[in-house]
């Protein structure tokens, strides 16, 4: 059977990624006509810099931050089946990208964001290490 | 203009029942929250609950929760709490307030509430 | 039950800057609020998110952060600045609004 180049595998771990992270924005952004407000009250910390894998760790901090804000949403409106399941495919998946031995100190933005500008902020960084692997 | 428009000052005894309320204009009612908020007699501010008037979902600060009870007509842009028997102790000023991006943006003018024997 | 912190009361000359601060265990998480309430008044928003301004709200009151404690300064301050101001945030949940027990900020002379 054929086997998957590791760049090609770490390609489709980040079209993965960004997919899953683009369904919790549109549902968040679902969400905005009704409770999006109670969501708003979180900080979320941004990285200074993020144009490498390693710079997921970044992101693998603040999942228990999105999991708070996903419980907040009761996932039923929300319409994700298992909200917690869902952020553990999210964490397994940033481990895979960056590796589970990564000892990367992420240094933050002064200025934390809400939830909505969190998740803008990471599919567009998502987006950007994809087309930069794909050049 | 957006506003809200509290009922007027109420004198009970106690063990009375009172319902008050916040009517809401200038704005879409149904998709904001509206947080209730309580003001002893030279005391501070302290958050009772809050209802959403879309689907009535209600949270409720743990010392209020059991105590008094939030509701919501959305044809009439109305927000209620309510008491089921009124103490002494129940005398301050209610606010209600709409709860917006995620600040209490827009106050009502309050309605006090006395209660005595 | 969750709870915000202040000082009960602070004192200031017109003119000087006033600070007034709030400390919360869930402060690094979630955002903090300031009202300011004048006697026989409802309160009124002066800082959401920290740090923002709501338009209408003058210059000289301004907002910051820094771990479990959130400050609302007043540079200048005036004698109409003279209330009582109280900061207000969520549980670590977000599923609790709290407010702090409130500032009584005195404008001397």
């Known amino acids: 059977a054929p086997t998957s180049s590791p760049a090609k595998e770490t390609q489709q771990h980040l079209e993965q990624l960004l997919l899953d992270l683009q369904v919790l924005l549109r549902g968040i952004d679902n969400y905005k006509n009704l409770k999006l407000p109670m969501m708003l009250t979180f900080k979320f910390y941004l990285p200074k810099q993020a144009t490498e894998l390693k710079h997921l760790q970044c992101l693998e901090n603040e999942l228990g931050a999105l999991q708070r804000v996903l419980d907040l949403t009761q996932s039923k409106s929300f319409h994700l089946e298992d909200a917690g399941n869902f952020i553990s495919n999210i964490r397994v998946t940033v481990v895979k990208l960056k590796g589970s031995e990564n000892k990367f100190e992420c240094q933050f933005d002064d200025e934390p964001a809400t939830v909505v500008e969190f998740l803008r902020r990471w599919i567009a960084i998502c987006q950007s290490i994809i087309s930069t692997m794909t050049q | 203009e957006v506003q809200l428009v509290q009922s007027g000052a109420e004198v009970k005894k106690p063990g009375e029942s009172l319902k008050i309320s916040c009517k809401g204009s200038g704005y879409n009612f149904d998709t904001y929250w509206i947080g209730w908020v309580r003001q002893m007699p030279g005391r501070g501010l302290e958050w009772m609950g809050t209802?959403?008037?879309?689907?009535?979902?209600?949270r409720y600060s743990p010392s209020f929760q059991g105590q008094v009870t939030t509701s919501a007509d959305k044809s009439i842009s109305t927000a209620y709490l309510q008491w089921g028997s009124l103490r002494a102790s129940d005398t301050a000023m209610y606010y209600c307030?709409?709860?917006?991006?995620?600040?209490?943006?827009?106050w009502g003018q309050g309605t006090m509430v006395t209660v005595s024997s | 039950s969750y709870e915000l912190t202040q000082p009960p009361s602070v004192s200031v000359s017109p003119g000087q800057t006033a600070r007034i601060t709030c400390s919360g265990d869930a402060l690094p998480r979630q955002f903090a609020y300031w009202y300011q309430q004048k006697p026989g008044q409802a309160p009124v928003l002066v800082i959401y998110k920290d740090t923002e301004r709501p338009s209408g709200i003058p210059e000289r009151f301004s907002g910051s952060s820094s771990g479990t404690t959130v400050t609302l300064t007043i540079s200048g301050v005036q004698a109409e600045d003279e209330a009582d101001y109280y900061c207000?945030?969520?549980?670590?949940?977000?599923?609790?609004?709290?407010f702090g027990g409130g500032t009584q900020l005195t404008v001397l002379g």
């Open positions: 307030a709409r709860f917006s991006s995620s600040a209490y943006d827009i």
């Open positions: 207000q945030s969520a549980d670590s949940s977000g599923t609790y609004h709290v």
């Open positions: 209802i959403y008037p879309a689907d009535s979902d209600t």
